[in-house]
């Protein structure tokens, strides 16, 4: 049970909290998910480092509560979504409180530097935010609850410290708790007030319902400082590995089943890829090659590691690269596959590689990618790189083997050569043609060789033949006499082949041509 001491959502006028400095937190009127007007505080001083913006509530009377809860609903912008901001951008803020017997003059500058604040916690945007429609805009709203105490003074102030985030404090609710009357674990317990300390436990005597087994005597439930019931001793329940039988007995879970905790109602069949060979198992062990992540409950199937990513596509633009790939064929039975990029800078011959410099930038990040795409920049020009794309899931850390990966070799800032502008016939025989050509206007590197494509004009282009030349001349042999051949040439550098040149036609000599040429050569 909760009793509210302050709730900004019920405020009809300005909250009138104190901001220091004035250029920090700003009170703004907004809308909640029901289009009710709410008072919010926002701050977004992300361009300047060393931010220290404080926001202090009005005085809150504790009404005899010893332990206080603060529920904060807020939205934080990802630093990555903010244009051109420095690394000092934050996605967290701090919560403090200050105990006092009376209202104090918070406008005085001395209060900010001398008040003995007590830090409650650093508050971060949780991964499990809810998408809420605030006045026509879908926002990622985080709800975080923190508690503090014991309190002895008449009341207190809350203080929120921003040190470089772009965020909005949508609502703050301050309350305390009592443990309600409940039926739990086969016993009935009365309503009980919480204790003075966060560690204090207030004993409540319970009565087992018929046919529940007393774990210990006397049967006790403890109301902790957070207003939650705890059962450290004397529980009326069946222990792990055993289940209630008609609420009168606890029988062992048969082989192939398990019961993980006292709170579970009954035995369950072992999940996929696990087994329990004996009776009374509290957990099913994973089969070889299958694992549980640290936070996987015993009820879920054991899972395996993913296979490697597939079909990598790389797009090189000077000293930047975009890598895209397809997800692994096998996810290991999990839906938390992420990707890590291992960047290695190599020697020209690729015989040895080393880890990339720290200044290489990965967008959105290098590790824990959720999308099959990464943009990599600030690489060295004209440098070979190898990128390993690892597929990781929640159980990869449990496997003795390294993560499956796919590698891609890339050389930065190296364009393919431009087209060869023209070809000349040097000579021709009945069965050969000798050609020459100039180097491409933009070789974009050292030309390794040329590839010549040729085919008889009467025939289909798809039946073409290929020849290679280390220089910019080539003799094509094995041709038929008196035939017209269509010829194209393209250059190759380490970056690959350029485009083929335009099609040019050349003809071998006929038998008559050849004889007349011989006659002309006679003295």
């Amino acid at each position: 049970m909760e009793e509210t001491l302050m709730d900004t959502r019920t405020a009809t006028a300005e909250l009138g909290w104190t901001a220091n400095p004035a250029s920090g937190w700003e009170e703004v009127s907004g809308y909640d998910e029901n289009l009710n007007t709410i008072r919010t505080y926002q701050v977004c001083n992300v361009f300047e480092p060393n931010q220290n913006n404080w926001l202090l509530t009005t005085f809150i009377n504790r009404r005899g509560a010893h332990r206080i809860y603060t529920e904060m609903r807020f939205t934080v912008r990802d630093c990555s979504s903010l244009p051109n901001v420095p690394g000092s951008c934050k996605e967290t803020f701090n919560l403090y409180y200050y105990e006092t017997d009376s209202v104090i003059a918070t406008k005085k500058s001395a209060f900010w530097s001398e008040a003995p604040y007590l830090k409650v916690d650093t508050i971060a945007a949780d991964e499990s935010f809810s998408q809420v429609d605030f006045g026509g805009r879908l926002m990622k709203v985080n709800t975080e609850v923190r508690s503090f105490g014991p309190l002895t003074r008449n009341g207190f102030y809350l203080a929120f410290q921003d040190y470089g985030a772009c965020m909005s404090l949508l609502s703050v609710r301050v309350f305390f708790k009592k443990c309600p009357s409940i039926v739990q674990n086969f016993a009935v317990f009365p309503e009980t007030m919480t204790g003075a300390e966060s560690t204090s436990l207030v004993i409540a005597r319970g009565t087992c319902i018929p046919n529940a087994e007393e774990v210990d005597v006397p049967i006790k439930l403890y109301c902790n400082g957070d207003g939650e019931w705890m059962v450290p001793i004397g529980r009326c329940t069946c222990k792990a590995g055993y289940e209630p039988e008609n609420s009168v007995a606890c029988k062992a879970c048969p082989a192939g089943t398990f019961k993980a905790s006292q709170e579970a109602e009954g035995c369950s069949h072992c999940p996929s890829n696990s087994r329990s060979p004996s009776e009374a198992s509290p957990i099913c062990t994973c089969r070889t090659g299958y694992y549980r992540a640290d936070f996987d409950p015993p009820e879920v199937a054991c899972t395996s590691v993913p296979s490697g990513p597939r079909n990598v596509i790389s797009i090189v633009n000077e000293t930047s690269i975009i890598l895209e790939w397809h997800p692994p064929r096998e996810t290991g039975g999990r839906d938390d596959v992420t990707y890590n990029i291992i960047c290695k800078k190599c020697r020209a011959d690729r015989r040895s590689c080393s880890r990339c410099d720290d200044n290489v930038e990965f967008v959105p990040r290098q590790l824990g990618l959720t999308e099959c795409r990464v943009s990599i920049s600030s690489l060295w020009a004209h440098t070979p790189y190898t990128f390993d794309i690892q597929a990781i899931n929640g159980v990869s850390s449990k496997s003795p083997f390294p993560p499956q990966h796919v590698s891609v070799n890339i050389t930065t800032n190296q364009a393919a050569p431009s087209t060869v502008p023209i070809m000349h016939q040097v000579s021709a025989t009945m069965r050969s043609i000798t050609l020459s050509w100039p180097q491409p206007e933009q070789p974009n590197g050292i030309i390794l060789d040329y590839e010549i494509r040729y085919y008889e004009k009467e025939h289909n282009e798809f039946n073409s033949s290929m020849a290679r030349s280390q220089t910019n001349t080539a003799r094509i042999d094995g041709l038929r006499p008196g035939m017209v051949y269509v010829v194209q040439v393209r250059a190759r550098t380490v970056a690959g082949y350029g485009k083929f040149s335009g099609k040019m036609c050349f003809q071998t000599l006929t038998d008559d041509d050849y004889k007349s040429e011989l006659r002309e050569q006679l003295p």
Partner: antibody, heavy 121, light 106 residues
Framework: QVQLLQSGAEVKKPGASVKVPCKAS????????MSWVRQAPGQGLEWMGW????????TYAQGFTGRFVFSLDTSVSTAYLQISSLKAEDTAVYYC??????????????WGQGTLVTVSS | EIVLTQSPATLSVSPGERATLSCRAS??????LAWYQQKPGQAPRLLIY???TRATGIPDRFSASGSGTDFTLTISRVEPEDFAVYYC????????FGQGTKVEIK
């Protein structure tokens, strides 16, 4: 009050250079990025890019690399746009604008009055 | 580059009438869209950011909505000082402006 003050009109010959200042006052210069926007006569707005006033790191939009340079002098709270090798098609009003970031979105909330640069032989 | 297309190019309305301006993006920009007003011989003025949040000092007759690729700016009752050119601008990927919609007196 918060304002951005730009210099008066400039007339330049093709091939020349121009440096347009934008002096900020009424706020902490390094707390906000500065954007540059071009508007050719009778045309719409074209975003040229921005500069982080804290780090000096510029970002240029497509079509505004090479001849266009953003720079700063934080000691006098001034941002500069320099255009070299001027062409007739560079004739336009050039605006500086403060970039305001909030948790709800971004926008250019304070604008200079604009500087008309005319390129003519 | 994300292209923003505004329609109509010109909107003729009488004072007191409602004006609805449209802006369509070539691909999704989420809620990363702003609206600006520009009067002849003046610098633009920020009206809306985050697709629907009014900038400081903007009258509540100006409202905006939309997300993804389709956005709308509405002037509930057009005042004489509202006749101007209105531009949308996205900041989802780099920044680009629409070509503008001129609101003129009918």
């Amino acid at each position: 009050q918060v304002q951005l003050l730009q210099s008066g009109a400039e007339v330049k010959k093709p091939g020349a250079s121009v440096k347009v200042p934008c002096k900020a006052s009424g706020y902490t210069f390094t707390s906000y990025a500065m954007s540059w926007v071009r508007q050719a006569p009778g045309q719409g707005l074209e975003w040229m890019g921005w500069i982080n006033t804290n780090t000096g790191n510029p970002t240029y939009a497509q079509g505004f690399t090479g001849r266009f340079v953003f720079s700063l002098d934080t000691s006098v709270s001034t941002a500069y746009l320099q255009i070299s090798s001027l062409k007739a098609e560079d004739t336009a009003v050039y605006y500086c604008a403060r970039v305001r970031l909030t948790v709800y979105g971004d926008g250019m909330d304070v604008w200079g009055q604009g500087t008309l640069v005319t390129v003519s032989s | 580059e994300i292209v923003l297309t505004q329609s109509p190019a010109t909107l003729s309305v009488s004072p007191g009438e409602r004006a609805t301006l449209s802006c369509r993006a070539s691909q999704s920009v989420s809620s990363n869209l702003a609206w600006y007003q520009q009067k002849p011989g003046q610098a633009p003025r920020l009206l809306i950011y985050g697709a629907s949040t009014r900038a400081t000092g903007i009258p509540d007759r100006f409202s905006a909505s939309g997300s993804g690729t389709d956005f709308t700016l509405t002037i509930s009752r057009v005042e004489p000082e509202d006749f101007a050119v209105y531009y949308c601008q996205q900041y989802g990927s780099s920044w680009t402006f629409g070509q503008g919609t001129k609101v003129e007196i009918k």
